[in-house]
Amino acid sequence: FGISGRHSITVTTVASAGNIGEDGILSCTFEPDIKLSDIVIQWLKEGVLGLVHEFKEGKDELSEQDEMFRGRTAVFADQVIVGNASLRLKNVQLTDAGTYKCYIITSKGKGNANLEYKTGAFSMPEVNVDYNASSETLRCEAPRWFPQPTVVWASQVDQGANFSEVSNTSFELNSENVTMKVVSVLYNVTINNTYSCMIENDIAKATGDIKVTESEIKRRSHLQLLNSKA
């Protein structure tokens, strides 16, 4: 590429997490170049014998791609010219976790940055009133989690209260034998109160809220990935 002096260019990555079985994004940006044909993107994974992905001269170059990534990777080709080297990873596997390197060569120089990619399973919880129970009971369900999370209940009225004695949590292995369904039941629920079911592992934290009054039930869910930092 005739890079004189081999200048260093800025490459920026963001640590992220992938939900197994779904598609994920490994984020990477760089100082853009005016000519697409002068840009080379290489994605590498620590301890892997082949490349994760290579994009050069405006197209994918996959002759040295490792077989574990075959048919599962793509860059956003139309965004490379503006400095987006992010990688789309299809059907995320548990074994995709690890340290990745985004390596860039342009006519201005070259640069690289590492990112930590965690993999697991996380899903939004749904909290419902269990009308089948003998007493007022709430049931919090989330279909897919891995590794096994912790589940904590909280209430707006009884802030700081420990609900472990009046709740029961179970984990049921899903059919693919990796992820688990999380079910937590909270007993002795009082009316006119907002309860929160918080599910957390080292990858994600999800909260399902339910507000129960005499006239209505309001629900809200929220999911946040942990440790996603540059």
Epitope: L49, G50, T95
Partner: antibody, heavy 122, light 107 residues
Framework: EVQLLESGGGLVQPGGSLRLSCAAS????????MSWVRQAPGKGLEWVSA????????YYADSVKGRFTISRDNSKNTLYLQMNSLRAEDTAVYYC???????????????WGQGTLVTVSS | DIQMTQSPSSLSASVGDRVTITCRAS??????LAWLQQKPGKAPKLLIY???SLESGVPSRFSGSGSGTDFTLTISSLQPEDFATYYC?????????FGQGTKVEIK
């Protein structure tokens, strides 16, 4: 100091099985791919198998495919080679070697164990 | 799989001689080629990686060159401790393949 120590070799009958181990120390084991290489008496080196740092990818020479299984336990810093349906031509000194950390960037086969002898004979 | 052919299979040389060993790949392995040295009863030792990069601690009399399919290991001035067998090894595919070896003997 990087050290690799193989064990598990010995005399086995044709058709039999053997499991080799390689205990690693002195480096971040999970960051590196690892390989097994063998050397028949008086012959050259033959690459047998490799495994990625996380264990998600395994690679085999055609001569052992379907008979040998490479694995690793990163919590124990140990590499394994399960050898089934052994043949006389599998007789060799088996070495474990540290493979690459990053494709195209780093050295490989820079550290080797002392080797363990596997003899397949009736 | 990529096949590696080394030549010569053996050679006799004297201390101080310049020695050249060649290695040819059956298909391009870019620059993904290593050279290793092995002495009898010992494990191999890495000398060169990425065709021409000298491994740390290896004397500068060893050098490597080439890319694609043709590679060369040169020992500029053979020393007594250099009498050994030398192997080239490709790592451009998921497999790794060794050449058959070149034995360097004392003339």
């Amino acid at each position: 100091e990087v050290q690799l120590l193989e064990s598990g070799g010995g005399l086995v009958q044709p058709g039999g099985s053997l499991r080799l181990s390689c205990a690693a120390s002195g480096f971040t084991f999970s960051s590196y791919a690892m390989s097994w290489v063998r050397q028949a008496p008086g012959k050259g080196l033959e690459w047998v198998s490799a495994i990625s740092g996380g264990g998600g990818s395994t690679y085999y020479a055609d001569s052992v495919k379907g008979r040998f299984t490479i694995s690793r336990d990163n919590s124990k810093n140990t590499l394994y080679l399960q050898m089934n349906s052994l043949r006389a031509e599998d007789t060799a000194v088996y070495y474990c070697a540290r493979d690459i950390q990053w494709f195209g960037e780093s050295t490989l086969f820079d550290y080797w164990g002392q080797g363990t002898l596997v003899t397949v004979s009736s | 799989d990529i096949q590696m052919t080394q030549s010569p299979s053996s050679l006799s040389a004297s201390v101080g001689d310049r020695v050249t060993i060649t290695c040819r790949a059956s298909q391009s392995t870019r620059s993904w080629l290593a050279w290793l040295q092995q002495k009898p009863g010992k494990a191999p030792k890495l000398l060169i990686y990425k065709a021409s990069s000298l491994e740390s601690g290896v004397p500068s009399r060893f050098s490597g060159s080439g890319s694609g399919t043709d590679f060369t290991l040169t020992i500029s001035s053979l020393q007594p401790e250099d009498f050994a067998t030398y192997y080239c090894q490709q790592y451009g595919s998921y497999s790794r393949t060794f050449g058959q070896g070149t034995k360097v003997e004392i003339k």
